[in-house]
Amino acid sequence: VEVQVSEDPVVALVDTDATLRCSFSPEPGFSLAQLNLIWQLTDTKQLVHSFTEGRDQGSAYSNRTALFPDLLVQGNASLRLQRVRVTDEGSYTCFVSIQDFDSAAVSLQVAAPYSKPSMTLEPNKDLRPGNMVTITCSSYQGYPEAEVFWKDGQGVPLTGNVTTSQMANERGLFDVHSVLRVVLGANGTYSCLVRNPVLQQDAHGSVTITGQPLTFPPEA
């Protein structure tokens, strides 16, 4: 028996369902009574789901997994993982035994998009050219950790005086706070881009200073 899985990682959004694909080629005359199927976490070897004695033995993992029972006899040993969490990320091994046995590992990459950044300034009034200002770009509930980029109005990257912190909440999702300290010119636009490296999702925020008063562009 030869087990096949997708070589590319399965990317799943938090709180959605994911299918970890696994298949084998049954011999003629194959019956489910012969099948021993095990899904387990590759690293810890913790059991996730199993099928033996001709029947589905159920989920051993948070009661959030399921097989596709009607498709097993055709060689489809895929696993459905419901309501994906950050902690589900990792490698899963699909082990199939009939007479011979084989296994293969499939990677699950969990992702969550970042919110549109909110921009704040400190100080936020009585600003004059030459003042030092702190601009904070905040984006929430994303996964995995973000990449943060700052640019000025001409698109020139701003890399100095940038401090970025990322804190995971109780669900493992990250809140990003990036602080740019800059000396104001006569006017200017400062934009922050928060990128999710897995989803290739970019979330933009910007603030424009045009003399007095300061203006924030309307949200797109």
Partner: antibody, heavy 118, light 107 residues
Framework: EVKLVESGGGLVKPGGSLKLSCAAS????????MSWVRQTPEKRLEWVAT????????YYPDSVEGRFTISRDNAKNFLYLQMSSLRSEDTALYYC???????????WGQGTSVTVSS | DIQMTQSPASLSASVGETVTITCRTS??????LTWYQQKQGKSPQLLVY???TLADGVPSRFSGSGSGTQFSLKINSLQPEDFGSYYC?????????FGGGTKLEIK
């Protein structure tokens, strides 16, 4: 008649290496998973390594992972166990065994003795 | 990892007696349990697989039972050739684990 014959055992110093062989006959070798199991001087049986019929997947307990390598030559009907960084606790009688499905080993060889001592 | 405990470690019995050897696991292993017999100076031989299925050629006085975490091997009307060592073995998490063995001796 299913027949498994191990060879290659002997006396080796700690840190040394040894390669065991198992000649299989009487069945379609490539259709079966194979394992090495050892029996300690205290008569305990310990699983050492397993390989799938096609040779694509191998499995080891933590105690030998990274030190032992199981392999097979389906054209010649041979199973191998390359052992390195040997320790005194690896001293045992090493059996090769054929799998029936995944969980059961239905035929065993007569064993080959490995002694790790300075 | 699932732990396995085989008992007793040794047992004395007479020909014609009935004996029972047990194997307990720390977690549910369904029916993934095998029993082997090993006679002095010989290699292990398959006796029972899938907890209760007798291997080909094994006399009907042997029987396996149990599921989940508790398993037993029963030998009715012991014969002289039944004396030796018995091992249970489970398969779980793509690992194969043997019990400590039971040495069955003639009383």
């Amino acid at each position: 008649e299913v027949k498994l014959v191990e060879s290659g055992g002997g006396l080796v110093k700690p840190g040394g290496s040894l390669k065991l062989s198992c000649a299989a006959s009487g069945f379609t070798f490539s259709s079966y998973g194979m394992s090495w199991v050892r029996q300690t001087p205290e008569k305990r049986l310990e699983w050492v390594a397993t390989i799938s019929g096609g040779g694509t997947n191998t499995y080891y307990p933590d105690s030998v992972e990274g030190r032992f390598t199981i392999s097979r030559d389906n054209a010649k009907n041979f199973l191998y166990l390359q052992m390195s960084s040997l320790r005194s606790e690896d001293t045992a009688l090493y059996y090769c065994a054929r799998h029936y499905g995944s969980q059961t080993m239905d035929y065993w060889g007569q064993g080959t003795s490995v002694t790790v001592s300075s | 990892d699932i732990q396995m405990t085989q008992s007793p470690a040794s047992l004395s019995a007479s020909v014609g007696e009935t004996v029972t050897i047990t194997c307990r696991t720390s977690g549910n292993i369904h029916n993934y349990l095998t029993w082997y017999q090993q006679k002095q100076g010989k290699s292990p031989q398959l006796l029972v697989y899938n907890a209760k299925t007798l291997a080909d050629g094994v006399p009907s006085r042997f029987s396996g039972s149990g599921s989940g975490t508790q398993f037993s091997l029963k030998i009715n009307s012991l014969q002289p050739e039944d004396f030796g060592s018995y091992y249970c073995q489970h398969f779980w998490s793509i690992m194969w684990t043997f019990g400590g063995g039971t040495k069955l001796e003639i009383k």
